[in-house]
């Protein structure tokens, strides 16, 4: 499948609109501080060059690799060293080291101002004046803040965004139409971002084998009627394109994703009965739809797993002859029977099975040793089931905000050295698991809860890696991805932590808090709760509830007062004093 010109090949496959969008995303993810206008200039230059290569594939430089072409573009920016410092050192390297160097400099937490959505009228004016520029800004702003965002999926979200604007800008009350729709889109995009970051982390840290195992498990749950060869083919293709996107090879990734969708739609009969509705859609919607498609119905009369994986005398022989294939078959067979398990749990079970075979196949009578392996899975299954039950009960009792606060206390006690904004972000996101998963039917809860939590904890790990402060977090983050959630759940209160000394200014508030939207008000209160726990890590639940209650009452009172600032100045110190007394 060799092409004389890689860039011409991708331009023709993707079409100009998607090509330009992907190049913009790529540049924005690598150079996260550059303004939109600078990136657009580069995108236009690359697009013009691609068009010359389409016209004549033998034209000068058209035979160069995409890494070389894109890298040369980035390295030609005159202000590169001033803006990016040591990232400019990458330019002294040759490919493929240069691209690896760019990847290492991607920043998961760039120092960028939070993105503030303009008011609806202003947005509609901008959109109607120039929809392409408006959507370009969206791609740029999301990509630079989320340097591992799944590029073809970001194009899908941009399409959704555009459709919302087209629909709402014709309405009388534009804001009423736009706000809830964009809020929902933002939630989905943020979830997509953390899920993709987990995939990239898994590939970066543990390589293709680990990611492929994840893909086999997930695909087997979704497509239980497909045979093992079909699942292996899909998992291999998904691994390849995910690696491309994580590696910044966005044109190849998007092209391969479209190819995979095409293949799935052409082979529905051997994959799943649920694909038809997705396959009728255009390319971006089709791929998105396939990625979210519901699990197919289980085939009737699936035999017991024990026959092939426990009772068969050939287990060790099969394992010795083709270790990865045999374990892959085990994972496939287990996963297709258990759509009610999380992928993380399925991978832990496969790991347990592998460890059992490693131990037992070395013995003189292996079958006597591995004969009870399926029974030994029971504690591994019970642990996340109990976690889901306990946390969903807590969520139902406290509601989302209260549940988030319980998690703030829990996680601050586990890792009090972690920065307050990171703890608030993590606990708020972990708390969303309630409204996202606990409302689902019983059989869907466990996969929803554990796989969502795994993605959120990966975000914690990625941020912590940048500035490691907690030994407990490092311990959980450096282990295997599938063991992270149980590791964090099992973390005790960090007894090595020396409580933070009390600073009155940390708990001093002003009238400006009153004008904040409810969500931001909550975050301020939650930041104060983190600080309280850092000050008094051994504070009890009732003590903290008392202080938080008083704090909420104080805010309500002062925000209703005639002279708000005077109220804050007068009652603030009283609140600080009573809080200290309550926690003494």
């Amino acid at each position: 499948d060799a092409h004389k010109s890689e860039i011409a090949h991708r331009f023709k496959d993707l079409g100009e609109q998607h090509f330009k969008g992907l190049v913009l995303i790529a540049f924005s993810q690598f150079l996260q501080k550059c303004p939109y206008e600078e990136h657009v200039k580069l995108v236009n230059e690359v697009t013009d060059f691609a068009k010359t290569c389409v016209a004549d594939e033998s034209a000068e430089n058209c035979d160069k690799s995409l890494h070389t072409l894109f890298g040369d573009k980035l390295c030609a920016i005159p202000t590169l060293r001033d803006s990016y410092g040591e990232l400019a050192d990458c330019c002294a390297k040759k490919e493929p080291e240069r691209n690896e160097c760019f990847l290492k400099h991607k920043d998961d937490h760039p120092n960028l101002p939070p993105f503030v959505r303009p008011d609806a009228e202003a947005m509609c004016t901008s959109f109607q004046e120039n929809a392409v520029t408006f959507m370009g800004h969206y791609l740029h702003e999301v990509a630079r803040r989320h340097p591992y965002f799944y590029a073809p999926e970001l194009l899908y979200y941009a399409e959704k965004y555009s459709a919302i604007m087209t629909e709402c800008c014709g309405e009388a009350d534009k804001a009423a139409c736009i706000t809830p729709k964009l809020d929902a889109l933002k939630e989905k995009a943020l979830a997509s971002s953390v899920n993709q970051r987990l995939k990239c982390s898994s590939l970066q840290r543990f390589g293709q084998r680990a990611f492929k195992a994840w893909a086999v498990a997930r695909m087997s749950q979704k497509f239980p009627k497909a045979d093992f060869a079909e699942i292996t083919k899909l998992a291999t293709d998904l691994t390849k394109l995910t690696e491309e996107c994580c590696h910044g090879d966005l044109l190849e990734c998007a092209d391969d994703r479209a190819e995979l969708a095409k293949y799935m739609c052409e082979n529905q009969a051997s994959i799943s009965s649920k694909l038809q509705a997705c396959c009728d859609k255009p390319v971006l919607k089709k791929s998105h739809c396939l990625s979210e498609v519901e699990n197919d119905d289980l085939p009737a009369d699936l035999p017991s797993l024990a026959a092939d994986f426990v009772e068969d005398k050939e287990v060790c022989k099969n394992y010795a002859e083709a270790k990865d294939v045999f374990l892959g078959t085990f994972l496939y067979e287990y996963a297709r029977r258990h759509p009610d398990y999380s992928v993380a749990l399925l991978l832990r079970l496969a790991k347990k099975y592998e460890a059992t075979l490693e131990k037992c196949c070395a013995e003189a009578d292996p079958s006597a040793c591995y004969g009870k392996v399926l029974d030994e899975f029971q504690p591994l299954v019970e642990e996340p089931k109990n976690l889901v039950k306990a946390n969903c009960e807590l969520f139902e009792k406290l509601g989302e905000y209260g549940f988030q606060n319980a998690l703030i206390v829990r996680y601050t006690q586990k890792a009090p050295q972690v920065s307050t904004p990171t703890l608030v972000e993590a606990a708020r996101n972990l708390g969303k698991v309630g409204s996202k998963c606990c409302v689902l039917p019983e059989a869907q809860r466990l996969p929803c809860v554990e796989d969502y939590i795994s993605a959120i904890l990966n975000r914690v790990c990625v941020l912590h890696e940048k500035t490691p402060v907690s030994e407990q977090v490092t311990k959980c983050c450096t282990g295997s991805v599938v063991e992270r959630r149980p590791c964090f759940s099992a973390l005790p209160v960090d007894e090595t932590y020396v409580p933070k000394e009390f600073k009155a200014e940390t708990f001093t508030f002003h009238a400006d808090i009153c004008s904040l939207p409810e969500k931001e008000k909550q975050m301020k209160k939650q930041a104060a709760l983190v600080e309280l726990v850092k000050h008094k890590p051994k504070a009890t639940g009732p003590q903290l509830r008392t202080v938080l209650g008083e704090f909420t009452a104080f805010l309500d009172k002062c925000c209703k007062a005639e002279d708000k600032e005077a109220c804050f100045s007068e009652d603030g110190p009283k609140l600080v004093a009573s809080s200290q007394a309550a926690l003494a």
Epitope: K313, E314, K317, C361, E363
Partner: nanobody
Amino acid sequence: QVQLQESGGGLVQPGGSLRLSCEASGFTFSRFGMTWVRQAPGKGVEWVSGISSLGDSTLYADSVKGRFTISRDNAKNTLYLQMNSLKPEDTAVYYCTIGGSLNPGGQGTQVTVSS
């Protein structure tokens, strides 16, 4: 590609001895328990003896206990079966297998005990 090559069989008189060898390749021999099985004419496969990966644990069928000794040399990827005090009923094709398998993978080696 897993390969198991048995050798050392032959014709021997009752009470005589033979030493069978099995050379293994295509897998990490030192990590797997190994087994000797045999198949007499017109009979099913019979498990004879097993040994752990390190050679520190051995098992024998009652019919061969005290007469046969299983051993291995992981440096040479080779499994052995020392057969003493052979009896006519030991006549069979002998196979080595991986980890308790009763499914002969190699060609086997013929042992005939007859006067």
